[in-house]
Amino acid sequence: HTAAQDNCTCPTNKMTVCSPDGPGGRCQCRALGSGMAVDCSTLTSKCLLLKARMSAPKNARTLVRPSEHALVDNDGLYDPDCDPEGRFKARQCNQTSVCWCVNSVGVRRTDKGDLSLRCDELVRTHHILIDLRHRPTAGAFNHSDLDAELRRLFRERYRLHPKFVAAVHYEQPTIQIELRQNTSQKAAGDVDIGDAAYYFERDIKGESLFQGRGGLDLRVRGEPLQVERTLIYYLDEIPPKFSMKRLT
């Protein structure tokens, strides 16, 4: 079977409906909300996951930005339009014909406008900074152990190759994970950093997207790493276009 060997389920996405109606009676899974077929050997795109998660409450945040062009997902949940490959369409609109442009991780990168708003291309988020604060521990974690454990986690749980984990910074109690990935760097089968970051974010919040797998149990040399808060910053290949009004 394609999805799972014996019971027809999707290990990487519990927000799916699966049935053995694929070629040769193989298990095939479709994302809730969109009905699109998903590959259960890898992460489902963030766009399809957001579409399946329409009922979740808004989670608005305001953050101090690490650079003038960094974006934070302050708008919370919305029902996105996804393209046939499951990626965000560059222009998103709500039911009241308010439209805006988003980046490849679905975060708004322009002021809101009307139906005349043009978004020429989907701008790629090529750098993601995941900022974590961990709960107090007896002592600081060893930096190289922490680095190795996070690289292993991103490879084994999220299938992200370690080449895309650009750096792990640590100043107790703050951990920063830098993910970097240009369009040209992605080879066949490589997971998108935006999808990996989203799965990680949901894991940290105790809202795992994985089917039947336990929640995230992060340990460094046997010592539990418990996260108190997470901030995620997104940097696009082309800086966002907001009016000065928004910045004041």
Partner: antibody
Amino acid sequence: QVQLVQSGAEVKKPGASVKVSCKASGYTFTSYWMHWVRQAPGQGLEWMGEITPSDGYTSYNQKFKGRVTITRDTSTSTAYMELSSLRSEDTAVYYCARGHGNYVSFDYWGQGTLVTVSS
Amino acid sequence: DIQMTQSPSSLSASVGDRVTITCRASQDISNYLNWYQQKPGKAPKLLIYYTSRLHSGVPSRFSGSGSGTDFTLTISSLQPEDFATYFCQQGYSLPPYTFGQGTKLEIK
């Protein structure tokens, strides 16, 4: 169709270096990982390292302790594997293989290059 | 590194037989297990990836199953061209990616 064509057999002396080439055709060279795997006579398969041709990123099997270097030339769609400080136990057939980023399966292989290390 | 152990290391069978080769990983590798066939003097060929997915052009008599640490390659009805050596390989962990030691399938 996808093809990986490797350079010919080599005979080297202990302590020398060897550089094996692998020319890819039939697909976009920069869109797939390239791996190198070796097989000593009558033995199993041993993964040596990988490269992403688009940006030249490499990672290696630590067993080779800096003796292996993988490079690529995108203008000719060719990958190279250089092994230095050769010893007799490096006598093997060396293969390049195209890889998938998620499954890490090697779906197409070169024909192999026999490297013999002998004094 | 993750160790991969195949069994048996060799086996004899006849054309038409159903044959099973097993592969065990030293730790959970989810479904990231691939199978290859190699004939003498030739490069390996991918048969099955991600435990059970058939590579293009591979006959349907080959199938794979398993999850976690225990995996199986099954040939439902042996054909003369199937006599070869079979290797499993894990693609789950950080590099290095590791292979089983091989199972030689011979004509009885």
